[in-house]
């Protein structure tokens, strides 16, 4: 028998420094977690103790804090090189700055293979990107070889900016021939490493012949066997075992997100490469693990440029700004309310006495809210805090839509409710009631909108044939998160101001904020 230790991260989202327990900015260092310096300590400890170790990343290193805003991926290459990652799969966010923003800072600088079997380059890009990422890589581990085959969410064109010269194929269809190639070279230990979410990870384990282990990302899935060590609630045991169509037991793992945990999986293979056993758990990277001094010193060196960029206080909050995915992808969250209020405030234009304002409505995909802000830091809000909440460098745009399009958008918001998907809408100037007992596509039971042609704003039922102005992220205007109906049916689209700037201006103007959860989004069962 031969034993392999797989260490894995996913959805780190630019958390190079240690963070608070909820993965926002570290306030009390003695209770902070994660960060590359602490990760390196644990990785090195395991490398010294165990013979056959791989360190893998399942994508979405890009995007999430000021580190990415300023360094644009150079920080990812530098620190992943320093930690000596063995391989990385491309995530959707690796394309947030376009293909050039992936090629120059990361693909050309990484000293480890970057993988995706289901992304195919075409046109002039094909020669430019050739060899910079690979479908698979065979790695020598001790006296054996291990094949790593990569995959990326085929939804990436809807979630990021990969451009028109990259084709994202079906994961399973693309993976099988690449695994077959490895099998024809006697590679009998194969890891699928990728970024398509836990449901797809399980399908890959079930359907792709020859894959022994699946290491995933994208859905921020937390798996754990036994009593979990922090706030995350396990979605299943670690590893999650899938029975493949050809009768094998295939372990599937993921390690939550934000560098809070280091996935730790031990696999035992027989001489033919069959998995005999698999066990492990994510390791919570809490303050009991010291930060490596040399990596920490490097972080501090790189940090100087960031400090100049964004440490001035914009204003204060006297309440917790809940931007967690657990809230904003499931229900009304006060961070969503704050952002929507800022978006409307930024568009106050009193140009007609008949209208108190030309626009009253805001919609915002919950998946675009990427971090909370803790008020227990003297209430201070900085640009850096906001860059973690709104890291994508988007704009808040003005569109005109028919009521019927808005109704479709709100149905889409909850069509697969409960899977922590980003399309759940936060709102401003809208009151919506959902009945989740109804079938998808028929769950919006009440949709009232704030009038504009009125001296005293009040909520009236949405009219299907009326044209409304709405402020929303450019991401939604472009059909992101599956909101194709907005892209296809919008009557006018005017691009607006940078998202962080809109919110920072609002906070500076208000000086002290205290957004509440106030019943903009409600749920009912059968009462309408």
């Amino acid at each position: 028998a031969w034993e392999l230790t797989i260490l894995h991260t996913n959805d780190v989202h630019s958390r190079l420094e240690q963070t608070s327990e909820d993965s926002s900015k570290c306030v009390n260092a003695s209770r902070c977690m994660g960060g590359v310096a602490r990760l390196f300590t644990k990785v090195q400890q395991i490398r010294r103790a165990e013979p056959n170790v791989l360190l893998l990343d399942a994508g979405d290193q890009y995007q999430g804090t000021i580190w990415f805003t300023v360094y644009k991926g150079a920080e990812v290459a530098h620190f992943m090189n320093a930690l000596r990652y063995d391989a990385m799969a491309l995530g959707n966010h690796e394309f947030d700055n376009g293909v050039e923003g992936l090629i120059e800072p990361l693909l050309k600088e990484a000293k480890f293979p970057i993988l995706s079997a289901n992304i195919k380059a075409k046109g002039p890009l094909a020669s430019q990107i050739s060899g910079l990422y690979l479908p698979y890589k065979v790695l020598p581990v001790g006296d054996e070889v291990v094949g790593i085959v990569g995959y990326t969410s085929k939804e990436t064109p809807f979630l990021s900016n990969p451009g028109t010269n990259l084709v994202f194929e079906d994961e399973i269809t693309a993976l099988q021939p690449e695994v077959d190639k490895l099998k024809t070279l006697n590679v009998n230990k194969i890891i699928a490493l990728g970024h398509s979410g836990f449901e797809m990870d399980k399908l890959i384990a079930q359907k792709v012949r020859g894959v022994d282990v699946v290491v995933g990302g994208h859905s921020n899935t937390f798996l754990y066997t036994g009593n979990p060590p922090s706030k995350e609630v396990p979605a299943g045991k670690y590893p999650f075992i899938v029975t493949s169509d050809d009768g094998r037991k295939v372990p599937v793992v993921q390690a939550y997100a934000f560098g809070k945990y280091l996935g730790y999986l031990k696999i035992e293979f027989d001489e033919r490469g069959n998995v005999i056993s698999s066990h492990g758990n994510p390791i919570l990277l809490n303050s009991s693990i010291p930060e490596d001094p040399s990596i920490k010193a490097d972080i501090n060196k790189w940090r100087i440029k960031l400090d100049n960029y964004s440490t001035q206080e914009l204003g204060k909050t006297i309440v917790y700004l809940d931007g967690s995915s657990q809230s904003c992808r499931f229900r009304e969250c006060n961070m969503g309310n704050l952002i929507c209020d800022a978006m409307i405030n930024n568009n106050l234009r009193h140009t007609d006495e008949m209208f108190w304002n030309h626009v009253s409505m805001c919609i915002l995909n919950g998946g675009g809210i990427r971090s909370p802000i803790d008020e227990r830091n003297n209430g201070t809000i900085t640009w850096e805090n906001l860059a973690a909440v709104l890291p994508f460098g988007g704009t808040f745009d003005l569109v005109q839509l028919k009521g019927s399009t808005l109704k479709k958008a709100f149905e889409h918001s909850v069509h697969r409710y409960g899977q922590s998907t980003g399309e759940f809408l936060q709102v401003g100037g809208i009151h919506v009631v959902y009945d989740l007992s109804r079938k998808p596509g028929d769950r919006v039971v009440k949709l009232d909108v704030l009038c504009t042609k009125c001296r005293v704003p009040s909520y009236d039922p949405l009219k299907m044939d009326e044209v409304y102005k709405v402020i929303l992220p450019n991401f939604l205007a472009n059909g992101g998160d599956g909101f194709q109906m907005i892209k296809d049916e919008l009557l006018r689209h005017d691009s607006g101001d940078q998202d962080i700037n809109v919110v920072s201006t609002y906070i500076s103007k208000m000086k002290v904020i205290y957004p509440a959860v106030e019943g903009r989004i409600k749920f009912s069962t059968g009462s309408h």
Partner: antibody, heavy 121, light 107 residues
Amino acid sequence: QVQLVQSGGGLVQPGRYLRLSCVASGFNFDDYAMHWVRQAPGKALEWVSGISDGGSATTYADSVKGRFTISRDNAKNTLYLQLNSLTAEDTAVYYCARAGSSWYFGAFDIWGQGTLVTVSS
Amino acid sequence: DIQMTQSPSSLSASVGDRVTITCRASQNIGSWLAWYQQKPGNAPKLLIYRASNLRSGVPSRFSGSGSGTDFTLTISSLQPEDFATYFCQQATIFPLTFGQGTKLEIK
């Protein structure tokens, strides 16, 4: 001793077919992936096709995809290559080769003696 | 496809000479490179695997080095039986590709 013995080559007309065989001895055939590599007269080696140890996975060079089929019969310790729709460009010496495992990954450590396929009218 | 370019294409040398053949890959192939020797009318024979590992039974005068894109095969002191054609081959990405060969002839 460890060896691969080939048969099945010969002269064939364009558009016709041929089947090459490669019999293994001296090692556990079903522990190894196997490949075909060809060499046109006076030219370099060209990889053609490969098959996994159990036969469930196969892969082909673009130049032969859809025309050639690799297969194996582990009970008979035999590797096959079915060559269909042959053209003059397929004229070459065809070698079967064993793919090295683990430490020898990526190298062909045992080769057959080769068999000449000539496609001509 | 990864192109493998060998140089020189042919080489004349004498018994006892030190000879170096180079192989360049069109992209990074790590260490997944093999070297073969082929004599006229015979099948190729594996000499070096993983860029620098000598196959058992192969004389120690043969050595390989390199990683990434640039590789060399060195014969420290040519023997009469070494006159043959030498091929490099990469196994990083399919299709597996070979160099065009270097013919080593007696001067």
